[in-house]
């Protein structure tokens, strides 16, 4: 007896973090035998949408012409072939930015830091929030979360980096969010340029060391540093 149909792949164009009002396309790629594609959204009646396959039948397109809060969430897709429905795809988390006012991002003691020293990026919101996210521009996996322990609301979160190397240099922004929806983020903060000077370079730090570092040149995820932030938030790498 044949095993279960292979699960499809699910992704979003141009990506999964979308500004309010912008368009996004969700793609579900199955097999050439697919007759129909179904997209389910967590906590919404299933199916959320159905589409006929595009030629040559191995994928379907689900279009969202204008991103709003209603579209933010966790999706899975399936395809139907002559022998039945496939396994579900891995989930796609579609995040909307622009839900809340932008936080402020600053560097302590300064955005100009000598290699080998320490710097803390401070993300502050005007109203209490329980999740703060730091991103480095151009990172493929941009999000580093700081989330409060028991839903406690905070006005700020600290992202310590130590020891700083040239790898940390670049442009950062932060977001804030409420815990009731991890898929709704604030507008982005204004950019903060972190400039690393000096030549106290050792070997490039590895994320597996006990004190790991922020993003690689372009395509490495931001990794949390070793110390616990003073804000009482705990760190999640997602």
């Amino acid at each position: 007896q044949a095993g279960p149909l292979p699960k499809p792949t699910l992704w979003a164009e141009p990506g999964s973090v979308i500004s309010w009002g912008n368009s996004v396309t969700i793609w579900c790629q199955g097999t050439l035998e697919a007759r129909e594609y179904r997209l389910d959204k967590e906590e919404s009646p299933a199916p959320w949408d159905r589409q006929n396959p595009l030629e040559p039948k191995n994928k379907a397109r689900f279009s969202i012409p204008s991103m709003t809060e209603d579209y933010a969430g966790r999706y899975r897709c399936y395809y139907r072939s002559p022998v039945g429905w496939s396994q579900p795809s891995d989930p796609l988390e579609l995040v909307m930015t622009g839900a809340y006012s932008k936080p402020t991002l600053s560097a302590l003691p300064s955005p100009l830091v000598t290699s080998g020293k320490s710097v803390t990026l401070l993300c502050q919101s005007r109203s209490p929030m329980d999740t703060f996210l730091l991103i480095k521009e151009r990172a493929a996996h941009p999000l580093l979360h700081l989330r409060s322990e028991h839903g406690a609301q905070q006005h700020q979160a600290e992202f310590p980096m130590s020891p700083v190397t040239s790898v940390h240099g670049g442009t950062y922004r932060c977001f804030s969010s409420h815990g009731f929806s991890h898929y709704l983020l604030s507008h982005p903060s204004d950019p903060l340029e972190l400039i690393v000077s000096g030549s106290l370079e050792g070997p490039r730090p590895s994320p597996t060391r006990s004190v790991s570092t922020a993003a690689g040149p372009e395509d490495q995820p931001l990794m949390p540093t070793g110390s616990v932030p003073h804000s009482g938030l705990r760190r999640h790498w997602e």
């Epitope: 164009e13 990506g15 973090v17 279009s63 012409p65 151009r138 493929a140 950062y172 932060c174 372009e218």
Partner: antibody, heavy 123, light 107 residues
Framework: QVQLQEAGPGLVNPSKTLSLTCTVS????????WSWIRQPPGKGLEWIGY???????NYNPSLQSRVTISVDMSKNHFSLKLSSVTAADTAVYYC?????????????????WGQGTTVTVSS | DIQMTQSPSSLSASAGDRVTITCRAS??????LAWYQQKPGKVPKLLMY???ALQSGVPSRFSGSGSGTDFTLTISSLQPEDVATYYC?????????FGQGTKVEIK
């Protein structure tokens, strides 16, 4: 600094399959959109298709029936196969990466390109 | 599929002139538009992304604007090194179509 390098035969016989690879150095191949683009002599740029992660693909509809783009994560490269080639497929072929997420709410354009490789289809 | 139409197809202007190239999408593409510069015999270079964001290292005389269907690339003061062909490209959703190109020359 991420760099891309195309490799493959410069001459392909008509009706055969053109095969090119693009090697990614200085960075990871995961989680970006990797494209192939071509430019016939004296003409404009034509997007061929992309691959994303381990196998999510989209192709130019005008080439879809002949194109396959695949990725080998272990070798940090991705490949283009174009079957049943004709003289009209003679072009400079580029591989490129579409940039990642910018915190301003934007996604980048194709910010890293290979140097391009000239492919001539002729017997 | 969405078509991208650039105009003009070529232009000639004097050094120091303000130059404007337009790109029109047959349907709305939000701000998911990039501009590229390709000098003769060279690899295309990303100038602008997200319609109006200047790519790192690109001179500030280049600017972009627009959203939806109509987009503009402006060179505020044309320099001899700007002689090239300029392409727009949509990347909202596949296919990532290019415009046909605008060739910019110096008088």
């Amino acid at each position: 600094q991420v760099q891309l390098q195309e490799a493959g035969p410069g001459l392909v016989n008509p009706s055969k399959t053109l095969s090119l690879t693009c090697t990614v150095s200085g960075g990871s191949i995961s989680s970006y959109f990797w494209s192939w683009i071509r430019q016939p002599p004296g003409k404009g740029l034509e997007w061929i298709g992309y691959i994303y992660n381990s196998g999510s693909t989209n192709y130019n509809p005008s080439l879809q029936s002949r194109v396959t783009i695949s990725v080998d994560m272990s070798k940090n490269h991705f490949s283009l196969k174009l079957s049943s080639v004709t003289a009209a497929d003679t072009a400079v072929y580029y591989c490129a990466r579409r940039g990642g997420y910018y915190g301003s709410g934007n996604y980048g354009g194709m910010d890293v390109w290979g140097q391009g490789t000239t492919v001539t289809v002729s017997s | 599929d969405i078509q991208m139409t650039q105009s003009p197809s070529s232009l000639s202007a004097s050094a120091g002139d303000r130059v404007t190239i337009t790109c029109r999408a047959s349907q709305g593409i939000s701000n998911y538009l990039a501009w590229y510069q390709q000098k003769p015999g060279k690899v295309p270079k990303l100038l602008m992304y997200a319609a109006s964001a200047l790519q790192s290292g690109v001179p500030s005389r280049f600017s972009g604007s627009g959203s939806g269907t109509d987009f503009t690339l402006t060179i505020s003061s044309l320099q001899p090194e700007d002689v090239a062909t300029y392409y727009c490209q949509k990347y909202d959703s596949a296919p990532w179509t290019f415009g046909q190109g605008t060739k910019v020359e110096i008088k």
